[in-house]
């Protein structure tokens, strides 16, 4: 577009008389004529070629410069070759001078020549001879000159003729600006070019509606002296819910969304989700479907899984092993885990209460990734119900009824719990006397206690046992100066309890010379 130019004066566009100031009045004349396209134009002509020392001035009206700093003057003129004019060789010239005068207001009709600043002497690239006069398309010269930077509100242009035969066909005064454009979704306003030929004016763009600046990359452009925008830096991008269409951001249509300004295009709503308005940044889940907090907006909405299948159990006294198959429907997710809910139920009304914290689960009660679990430390001869629930990332968001597989069982006789409070009562060179307390939960009648012992450095490779019915015993025939490890467990008709924690005991060193040895008090001798 040649519209990089903002016209301040265009003599050719004026149909009425220009009425510029001519001094002396006999010099430059305003004449109506036709241009090469037979369009009526107003021209100024001077052809005072007979007399020497011509000084004919023509001054434009006052030109307001607007907000321009550098002004361009384009002159179109024809200049007649002095050789085509008979008898004027000594007095005819083939150049004229261009001047300007800056002022803040119209100073009237006087031309004060001394105030004018010379821009240049203008010569024709092509003058024409008598032989060219018949052609309508006369040799039109175009010359462009710059003035500036200007500091006042306006200026006059003046043309000084020194004895040439000239027609000023067109005087165009303009400044250049970079016209408002949209680039990279940023609007850059009309910008007047800088004051110097090489200057670049940096302009910051404003994002179009529904766009935002790219992170740390503000849109900027440079307006060149020629009125051209140079390489853009940075950009705007369409906000969430909007996508680029040409130089604008249009809202995503229904059933489409765009979750982030970083995404280029709107996308169709994922499975089991919808958007019923334009400009959506995310799609809502259908009833019964959910999106976990960690789910990105582009994944489908999902639902809790169905119940595990094929739940089976195995009871070993007070331990129950449960095993099951995955649910038929994982809800569309692959983060399915399992949780076990244990309830102890009464014999009468079938009322159940949560089992409490004494129960043990192997490997764990919740977050089970495998489809089996062992539940331990149940009460003997008790009724239990176990619910196995499959859960996924959206189970906790669902308000609908839980889906689970359940099984009810009754435990058998339980082995006694662990012996506690094992103490060394007496330590000699070849014997150790121990005492302990019966288990907290005997789970029946304790028929005996079993003491296991071995030399510590043997690490249980060989060990001895001693059985006793009472809660104390003396272990004899030990080696002097040796560390032994002792563990005790209770025995009932239901089986063996767990061994007590290890107890390390060192027998006394053997004394030099004969020494009295007391007999260990024991309810039973060690079997040898």
């Amino acid at each position: 577009q040649a519209a990089k130019e903002v016209l301040l004066l265009d003599s050719k566009a004026q149909q009425t008389e220009l009425e510029w100031i001519s001094s002396p009045p006999s010099g430059w004349e305003e004449i109506s004529g036709l241009d090469e396209n037979y369009t009526p134009i107003r021209t100024y002509q001077v052809c005072q070629v007979m007399e020497p020392n011509q000084n004919n001035w023509l001054r434009t009206n006052w030109i307001s410069k607007g907000n321009a700093q550098r002004i361009f003057v384009e002159l179109k003129f024809t200049l007649r070759d002095c050789n085509s004019l008979p008898g004027v060789l000594g007095t005819c010239k083939e150049t004229f001078n261009l001047y300007y005068y800056e002022t803040d207001y119209d100073t009237g009709r006087n031309i004060r020549e001394n105030l004018y600043v010379k821009i240049d002497t203008i010569a024709a690239d092509e003058s024409f001879t008598q032989g060219d006069l018949g052609e309508r398309k006369m040799k039109l010269n175009t010359e462009v000159r710059e003035i500036g930077p200007l500091s006042k509100k306006g200026f006059y242009l003046a043309f000084q003729d020194v004895g040439a035969c000239i027609a000023l066909v067109s005087v165009k005064v303009y400044y250049k600006k970079c016209w408002s454009i949209v680039e990279n979704l940023a609007v850059f306003p009309d910008t007047v070019t800088g004051s110097e030929f090489s200057s670049l004016v940096e302009v910051r763009g404003t994002c179009v509606s529904s766009a935002e600046e790219e992170a740390e990359n503000s849109p900027r452009m440079h307006c060149s002296a020629e009125g051209e925008w140079l390489v853009p830096i940075g950009k705007c991008i369409c906000k969430a819910g909007y996508q680029q269409k040409g130089d604008t951001c249009e809202p995503c249509g229904r059933r489409f969304y765009k979750s982030s300004s970083q995404d280029l295009q709107c996308s169709r709503c994922p499975t089991h989700s919808f958007s019923d308005r334009e400009g959506s940044s995310r799609c809502e889940c259908e009833d019964g479907y959910y999106r976990a907090p960690s789910d990105p907006p582009y994944v489908a909405c999902t639902r809790p899984p169905s119940a595990p299948q094929n739940l089976i159990f195995n009871i070993n006294q007070t331990t129950v092993s449960l095993e099951w198959s995955p649910p038929a429907d994982n809800g569309g997710r692959n983060d399915v885990t399992y949780r076990i809910l244990c309830k102890r139920c009464s014999w009468e009304q079938g009322e159940c209460v949560p089992c409490g914290s004494n129960i043990g689960y192997m490997p764990q009660q919740t977050g089970l990734e495998d489809n089996y679990v062992t539940v331990m430390d149940l009460l003997a001869h008790a009724n239990y119900t176990f619910e196995v629930e499959a859960v996924n990332g959206v189970s906790d968001l669902s308000r609908s009824q839980r889906l689970f597989a359940a099984v009810s069982i009754t435990t058998g006789q339980a082995a006694p719990s662990q012996v506690s409070g094992v103490m060394k009562e007496r330590v000699l060179q070849r014997s150790v006397q121990l005492s302990w307390q019966e288990p907290e939960h005997p789970n029946g009648v304790i028929t005996e206690y079993e003491i296991k012992y071995y030399e510590k450095d043997q690490r249980e490779r060989t060990y001895s046992t001693l059985k006793t019915k009472s809660t104390s015993a003396s272990i004899n025939n030990l080696k002097p100066g040796t560390v032994y490890v002792f563990q005790i467990r209770a025995v009932t008709a239901a089986g063996y309890g767990n061994y007590s924690p290890r107890l390390d005991v060192a027998t006394l060193e053997e004394a030099s010379g004969k020494m009295f040895e007391a007999t260990a008090v024991s309810s039973e001798q060690n079997p040898v």
Epitope: G33, M50, E51, T78, L85, G90, T91, Q130, G134, C165
Partner: antibody
Framework: QVQLLQSGAEVKKPGASVKVPCKAS????????MSWVRQAPGQGLEWMGW????????TYAQGFTGRFVFSLDTSVSTAYLQISSLKAEDTAVYYC??????????????WGQGTLVTVSS | EIVLTQSPATLSVSPGERATLSCRAS??????PAWYQQKPGQAPRLLIY???TWATGIPDRFSASGSGTDFTLTISRVEPEDFAVYYC????????FGQGTKVEIK
């Protein structure tokens, strides 16, 4: 305003001379050349030639050399046409006309009212 | 010397009509002729010179065109004051006039 003033009619005998003045006013006399044009009774226009009012240098058209002389008195802004050895066929209206040179072409833009010279015995 | 021939010698038109006057050169000329109007008992008056420039005060119903050897003066709508004799004039090293065309009321 710009005008060219010529003298009244002249009646001359064959062989005589006549000097027709053309007084210019309203512009700088020396800035424009002056042409002379003859129009015989009932006839068309004939260009006789012109004089550079700045240098005094004359140019004569074919058929108007010898007996015809263009001269100036710039002090009174007057151009003169002198015809000597008048003949009956010199009977005509003689016009002075200011020459206009322009970029686009030339012409005679201001004319005197004409002086009728009658040559009769 | 270039001879200019004007035609017709007389042109009869009614006011408001278009009038077309011709001027033919004996050889190709590089410059468009000047055109003059002369009314009885008056000095000639310059109308147009250089094909595209009107003399001061000349109405734009007068226009000139042509090139080479054939030139035309056109009066788009003849007014009562336009009835007169019209001359074309060629300029250059030597200037010559055509013999004139009389435009009279029909």
């Amino acid at each position: 305003q710009v005008q060219l003033l010529q003298s009244g009619a002249e009646v001359k005998k064959p062989g005589a001379s006549v000097k027709v003045p053309c007084k210019a006013s309203g512009y700088t006399f020396t800035s424009r050349a002056m042409s002379w044009v003859r129009q015989a009774p009932g006839q068309g226009l004939e260009w006789m030639g012109w004089i550079n009012t700045n240098t005094g240098n004359p140019t004569y058209a074919q058929g108007f050399t010898g007996r015809f002389v263009f001269s100036l008195d710039t002090s009174v802004s007057t151009a003169y046409l002198q015809i000597s050895s008048l003949k009956a066929e010199d009977t005509a209206v003689y016009y002075c006309a200011r020459v206009r040179f322009t970029v686009y072409g030339d012409g005679m833009d201001v004319w005197g009212q004409g002086t009728l010279v009658t040559v009769s015995s | 010397e270039i001879v200019l021939t004007q035609s017709p010698a007389t042109l009869s038109v009614s006011p408001g009509e278009r009038a077309t006057l011709s001027c033919r050169a004996s050889q190709s000329v590089s410059s468009n002729p000047a055109w003059y109007q002369q009314k009885p008992g008056q000095a000639p008056r310059l109308l147009i010179y250089g094909a595209s420039t009107w003399a001061t005060g000349i109405p734009d119903r007068f226009s000139a065109s042509g090139s080479g050897t054939d030139f035309t003066l056109t009066i788009s709508r003849v007014e009562p004051e336009d009835f007169a004799v019209y001359y074309c004039q060629q300029y250059g090293p030597s200037w010559t006039f055509g013999q004139g065309t009389k435009v009279e009321i029909k």
